[in-house]
């Protein structure tokens, strides 16, 4: 009795089993290792990659696909041959029996044979349909890989043209260096002449200094008299101040000016004359709400408000939406200033964003965006960036156009997965995208092949977790 079964074996290949009489035929149709069937929830053309697959890898995969196609064809041919052989044997048997049996019996056998043939043909059609499905799927994957290959070829061409441009630039710079060397020799000669003239001047000045030293001795005597007078004056002033403070404490002149001043950002702190790195109190725009932030008053002219810092893994960055909204951590160490403050600040005027990165090999790089702002909470603090320059990659590692902010309890990314839960930390995830500076902190020698680390893809690749990061903002017109 004919019978047909489809199942999966232990290693995931599809099995097609045909039962005919006492014989059963099992066809193992191979599937490519790294491909999945369309019934799988993982749809290959929806997969987000940080970068296209290597060209060689694609070629290799195409060859594997061709081999599978060949195998399938061979299986079909074998199947057809077998059925033909089987038919021949049965026909011979029928002919031998026909001499001894009556016509009625022959007709019955003929009918049975026709039924069996029809059944087998139907089963064969089913198998062919299955193989055809498999072949169609493989063709689709083949097409996808060829698209990926085209993309790679285009990228290679782009890179080649860029290399050519760089070579042109290089030769131009070499010429410039040579010209500068010539200039340098001429300058050295003139410097030598100036040096001789200066030596003459120095000797003249030495004699003048000797005379001045004599005059200083006389002035010192007078100075001590002045110092005593100044001391007496200071005492009088202090007494007056004490008298004033007891009579009217509210108008006390010793109260520092700083008390009446509020600063919106570190640029304002800097402009008020406080040019030392440190923690300062800032006030929200159009409000009395306050927050403390670290101000970098040295890097690139100073006045930078630090909105994020990672340096040692001491602070957990897998936080809630509210914590990312209001800020967490300590401004002297690892911290997130808070999306609400940054959003309000960057919507008041135009700000630039600088992201400073350090790897574990002692290298540093930065990305500078000439215009940065965050949307309001209603729009999930969506990031807006324009005009990238810097050394941490020519392509923005924060996906463009900007994405909404996502946290473990606020999933606003473009992935069916939850990027924040999967990669840890709150960030402007795409699906999930080429960066996450709020990922897990991994120490040295444990920082590679980490999908959930502190990532800036276009500088260090997808699996590299950075040593330190700082995000800072400053008004564009500073």
């Amino acid at each position: 009795y004919n019978n047909f079964r489809k199942s999966m074996d232990s290693i995931g290949k599809k099995q097609y089993q045909v039962q005919h009489g006492s014989c059963s035929y099992t066809f193992l149709l191979p599937e490519m290792d790294n491909c999945r069937s369309s019934s799988s929830p993982y749809v290959s053309n929806a997969v987000q990659r940080d970068a296209p697959l290597e060209y060689d890898d694609s070629v290799q995969r195409l060859q594997v696909l061709e081999n599978i196609m060949e195998n399938n064809t061979q299986w079909l041919m074998k199947l057809e041959n077998y059925i033909q052989d089987n038919m021949k044997k049965e026909m011979v048997e029928i002919q031998q029996n026909a001499v001894q049996n009556q016509t009625a019996v022959m007709i019955e056998i003929g009918t049975n044979l026709l039924n069996q043939t029809a059944e087998q043909t139907r089963k064969l059609t089913d198998v062919e349909a299955q193989v055809l499905n498999q072949t169609t799927r493989l063709e689709l994957q083949l097409l996808e890989h060829s698209l990926s290959t085209n993309k790679l070829e285009k990228q290679i061409l782009d890179q080649t043209s860029e290399i050519n441009k760089l070579q042109d630039k290089n030769s131009f710079l070499e010429k410039k260096v040579l010209a500068m060397e010539d200039k340098h020799i001429i300058q050295l000669q003139s410097i030598k002449e100036e040096k001789d003239q200066l030596q003459v001047l120095v000797s003249k000045q030495n004699s003048i200094i000797e005379e001045l030293e004599k005059k200083i001795v006389t002035a010192t005597v007078n100075n001590s008299v002045l110092q005593k007078q100044q001391h007496d004056l200071m005492e009088t002033v202090n007494n007056l101040l004490t008298m004033m403070s007891t009579s009217n404490s509210a108008k006390d002149p010793t109260v520092a000016k700083e008390e009446q001043i509020s600063f919106r950002d570190c640029a304002e702190v800097f402009k008020s004359g406080h040019t030392t790195n440190g923690i300062y109190t800032l006030t929200f725009p159009n409000s009395t709400e306050e927050i403390k932030a670290y101000c970098d008053m040295e890097a690139g002219g100073g006045g930078w408000t630090i909105i994020q810092r990672r340096e040692d893994g001491s602070v957990d960055f897998q936080r809630t939406w509210k914590e990312y909204k209001v800020g967490f951590g300590n401004p002297s160490g690892e911290y997130w200033l808070g999306n609400e403050f940054v959003s309000q600040l960057t919507n008041q005027q135009r700000y630039v964003l600088k992201i400073h990165l350090k790897d574990w090999e002692g290298n540093e790089a930065y990305s500078l965006y000439e215009h940065f702002y965050l949307s309001s909470e209603e729009l999930n603090y969506r990031i807006h960036l324009k005009g990238l320059t810097g050394t941490a990659g020519k392509i923005s590692s924060i996906s463009q156009p900007g994405n909404d902010f996502s946290t473990k309890d606020g999933d606003n990314d473009k992935c069916i997965c939850k990027c924040s839960q999967m990669l840890t930390g709150g960030w402007w995830f795409d699906a999930c995208g080429p960066s996450n500076l709020n990922g897990m902190y991994y120490p040295q020698r444990q920082n590679t092949n980490k999908f959930n680390g502190i990532k800036w893809y276009y500088w260090k690749g997808s699996g590299y977790s950075l040593k330190a990061t700082t995000m800072m903002i400053r008004p564009a017109d500073f």
Partner: antibody, heavy 119, light 107 residues
């Protein structure tokens, strides 16, 4: 373990002066704003003074402005409160406190030092 | 200055009861409210900040809630050791101001 230990309290006459100290340990003192908070005999809590990490910014309520001065010595991990022209309403338990970092909620408090202003 | 008002000076409760202590700010403080517990002879201890975030080591029977100007500290099942003074404080702006305190008494 974070520790804040106040000292310098005592009995003083109205118009007199007193200097309170707070010795900090168990954390990087120069990384945090520091505060003085007092508790009146009626158990009311009142903020008295704030000083920034470097000491360049100081803040006071109007009730003590001009009479009290907050200062710090980051090398010695010490916080100070110089009180002058003391009044009877300054009688209180004075606590030295440290915040969490970004905002002024007080995570750590000292055991307090009692200041009594009485004739 | 922002004024924080705790309308109940005293609250009497029994062990196992649920109790809610309220606090009202004179203006919207955007959930920038902290709660402290002060037991007799001790310094105040931080329980809650940002209106609802429990400080490390604080038992989960203590919960904070509220927004705008109205805030509440709730003890779901009062224990004998919860006998104390409870203060609210706004950490929205300078000066940081405290409520006058609510004394929780055990019947």
């Amino acid at each position: 373990e974070v520790q804040l230990v106040e000292s310098g309290g005592g009995l003083v006459k109205p118009g007199g002066s007193l200097k309170l100290s707070c010795a900090a340990s168990g954390f990087t003192f120069s990384d945090y704003y520091m505060y003085w908070v007092r508790q009146t005999p009626e158990k009311r809590l009142e903020w008295v003074a704030t000083i920034s990490v470097g000491g360049s910014f100081t803040y006071y309520p109007d009730s003590v402005k001009g009479r009290f001065t907050i200062s710090r010595d980051n090398a010695k991990n010490n916080l100070y409160l110089q009180m002058s022209s003391l009044k009877s309403e300054d009688t209180a338990m004075y606590y030295c406190a440290r915040d969490w970092g970004l905002r002024p909620w007080f995570v750590y408090w000292g055991q307090g030092t009692l200041v009594t202003v009485s004739a | 200055d922002i004024v924080m008002t705790q309308s109940h000076k005293f609250m009497s409760t029994s062990v196992g009861d649920r109790v809610s202590i309220t606090c009202k700010a004179s203006q919207d403080v955007s959930t920038a409210v902290a709660w402290y517990q002060q037991k007799p002879g001790q310094s105040p201890k931080l329980l809650i900040y940002w209106a609802s975030t429990r400080h490390t080591g604080v038992p989960d029977r203590f919960t904070g809630s509220g927004s705008g100007t109205d805030y509440t500290l709730t003890i779901s099942s009062v224990q004998a050791e919860d006998l104390a003074l409870y203060y609210c404080q706004q950490h929205y702006s300078t000066p940081p101001t405290f409520g006058s305190g609510t004394k929780l008494e055990i019947k």
